[in-house]
C-alpha cells in the first residue's frame, strides 16, 4: 500500500491556524479573520459595509478590525452612546469627573499621574536612603535596599545595635518588608495605609 506522510510536518498553516493531514495532504482550519489554503490572507472586514455604526470608520487589522467612532459614540461597533465616566476610564483608584458632554478628568490617588492615572510616579529622585542604601520605588513612597550593616526602611538602623527600639520607629511590616527586600532580593512595594 501507499506510505502515509504527515503533510503538517512542514508547518504550512499560517496565522495560528490548525493543521490536519488528510490523504497525505494538509488541510488548514483558519482562525476568524484569515482565509486561503494556508490561512495566509487577512480578511478585510472593512470590505463588508455596516460593521461600524453611527458613522464610525472601519480600520482593518490582521485577523480583525477596529471601529473608530465619531464623538459621542463608543463600543466595539460604535453602537453605544459615550458617557465620559461610565465606565470610569480612571485606573489605580482614580476618581472620574465629567467635565463636558464628551470630556472627563481623573482625580488620581497620591502616587499616580497621567490622564487616566496610569503612571506610578517614581519617588526615587527625591529619596533619602541613608548609609549607602539604594532606592526602590513604591506607591507614593520608596524603600531602601540596605548594605549588610544597616537596616530599617531608610537604612538608618545599625544592625550591630540589635533591634532595641526599632519598633519605636518602624512597624513590624516595614521591617519584614526590608528583610525580604535585602536578604531575598525581592522588590516588594510597600503600600502605606
Amino acid at each position: 500500500g501507499s506510505q502515509w506522510t504527515d503533510a503538517c510536518l512542514s508547518h504550512p498553516c499560517a496565522n495560528g491556524s490548525t493543521c490536519t493531514t488528510v490523504a497525505n495532504q494538509f488541510s488548514c482550519k483558519c482562525l476568524t479573520g484569515f482565509t486561503g489554503q494556508k490561512c495566509e490572507t487577512d480578511v478585510n472586514e472593512c470590505d463588508i459595509p455596516g460593521h461600524c455604526q453611527h458613522g464610525g470608520t472601519c480600520l482593518n487589522l490582521p485577523g480583525s478590525y477596529q471601529c473608530q467612532c465619531l464623538q459621542g459614540f463608543t463600543g466595539q461597533y460604535c453602537d453605544s452612546l459615550y458617557v465620559p465616566c461610565a465606565p470610569s476610564p480612571c485606573v489605580n483608584g482614580g476618581t472620574c469627573r465629567q467635565t463636558g458632554d464628551f470630556t472627563f478628568e481623573c482625580n488620581c490617588l497620591p502616587g499616580f499621574e497621567g490622564s487616566t492615572c496610569e503612571r506610578n510616579i517614581d519617588d526615587c529622585p527625591n529619596h533619602r536612603c541613608q548609609n549607602g542604601g539604594v532606592c526602590v520605588d513604591g506607591v507614593n513612597t520608596y524603600n531602601c535596599r540596605c548594605p549588610p550593616q544597616w537596616t530599617g526602611q531608610f537604612c538608618t538602623e545599625d544592625v550591630d545595635e540589635g533591634n532595641s527600639g526599632l519598633n519605636d520607629i518602624f512597624e513590624a511590616q516595614k521591617i519584614e518588608w526590608h528583610e525580604n527586600l535585602y536578604f531575598q532580593g525581592h522588590h516588594h512595594h510597600h503600600h502605606h495605609h
Epitope: Q130, G132, N140, T141, I169
Partner: antibody, heavy 120, light 107 residues
C-alpha cells in the same frame, strides 16, 4: 570632632554671583549627604540644596526657588562643599548654613553660617 | 512638597513647666522627623531624630513621639537654657521642609 566652617558670604548686587565654601573635618566627607540651608533675618529655616554621598553617586537635588541659579558641588580632596550662586535676587538674602546629614534623616552637624546680602 | 504645620508659633512658660510643641505633616513621613533648637545668632542644634530618638548629649527632659503625620516634642521640665526657637523638619524626602518654628519665651 566634627566641624563645618562656611566662608564666602558678603554683599552682592541683584543679578550678581557669589561662591560659598564649607570646609569640613572630623569625618569621612564622601560618606555623608551634605546640605545647604538658609535663614532670612527673623524668619524660619529653608532648605536650599543637597548633594548625596559617594554610595549614591553624589547625586544632587535643589529647591524650586534656586534651581537653575545655584550649583552645589564638592571637592573630596579638600573636604570642601561649595554653593555657587548666580543671578542672585534680593530674596536670596539670608544666613547660609552648611550641614551634614548624619545618616539618620536628620542634620546632626551645622556650620556657624555665612551672611549673604543681595542689595543694590 | 511636604507641608509642615508647627504649633503653637510661640509659647510663654516658666522654669519647671512642661512644654509641648506639635508638628503635622501633609503626608505620611514614616517617622522621618527631626527636632532642632536654635538660639539667637546661633546655628540650629539637633535634639531628636527618627521622631523619638534622643541625639547624643541632649538632656533627657527632651522627648519626641508620633508617627504617620502627627508628631510632638515635649520638654518635661523647662530649664533657663531651654528658652529658644524650636523647629521640626521632615527627612523622608526632598525637598527637606521645616516647620515655621515655635518660640519658647519666658513668662
Amino acid at each position: 570632632e566634627v566641624q563645618l566652617v562656611e566662608s564666602g558670604g558678603g554683599l552682592v548686587q541683584p543679578g550678581g554671583s557669589l561662591k560659598l565654601s564649607c570646609a569640613v573635618s572630623g569625618f569621612t566627607f564622601s560618606d555623608f549627604y551634605m546640605e545647604w540651608v538658609r535663614q532670612a533675618s527673623g524668619k524660619g529655616l529653608e532648605w536650599v540644596a543637597a548633594q548625596r554621598n559617594k554610595a549614591n553617586d553624589f547625586s544632587i537635588v535643589y529647591s524650586a526657588s534656586v534651581k537653575d541659579r545655584f550649583t552645589i558641588s564638592r571637592d573630596d580632596s579638600k573636604s570642601t562643599l561649595y554653593l555657587q550662586m548666580n543671578s542672585l535676587k534680593t530674596e536670596d538674602t539670608a544666613v547660609y548654613y552648611c550641614s551634614r546629614d548624619g545618616g539618620r534623616l536628620a542634620l546632626d552637624a551645622w556650620g556657624q553660617g555665612t551672611l549673604v546680602t543681595v542689595s543694590s | 512638597d511636604i507641608q509642615m504645620t508647627q504649633s503653637p508659633s510661640s509659647v510663654s512658660a516658666s522654669v519647671g513647666d512642661r512644654v509641648t510643641i506639635t508638628c503635622q505633616t501633609s503626608e505620611d513621613i514614616y517617622s522621618g522627623l527631626a527636632w532642632y533648637q536654635q538660639k539667637p545668632g546661633k546655628s540650629p542644634k539637633l535634639l531628636i531624630y527618627g521622631a523619638s530618638r534622643l541625639q547624643d548629649g541632649v538632656p533627657s527632659r527632651f522627648s519626641g513621639s508620633g508617627s504617620g503625620t502627627d508628631y510632638t516634642l515635649t520638654i518635661s521640665s523647662l530649664q533657663p537654657e531651654d528658652f529658644a526657637t524650636y523647629y521640626c523638619q521632615q527627612g523622608f524626602k526632598y525637598p527637606l521642609t521645616f516647620g515655621g518654628g515655635t518660640k519658647v519665651e519666658i513668662k
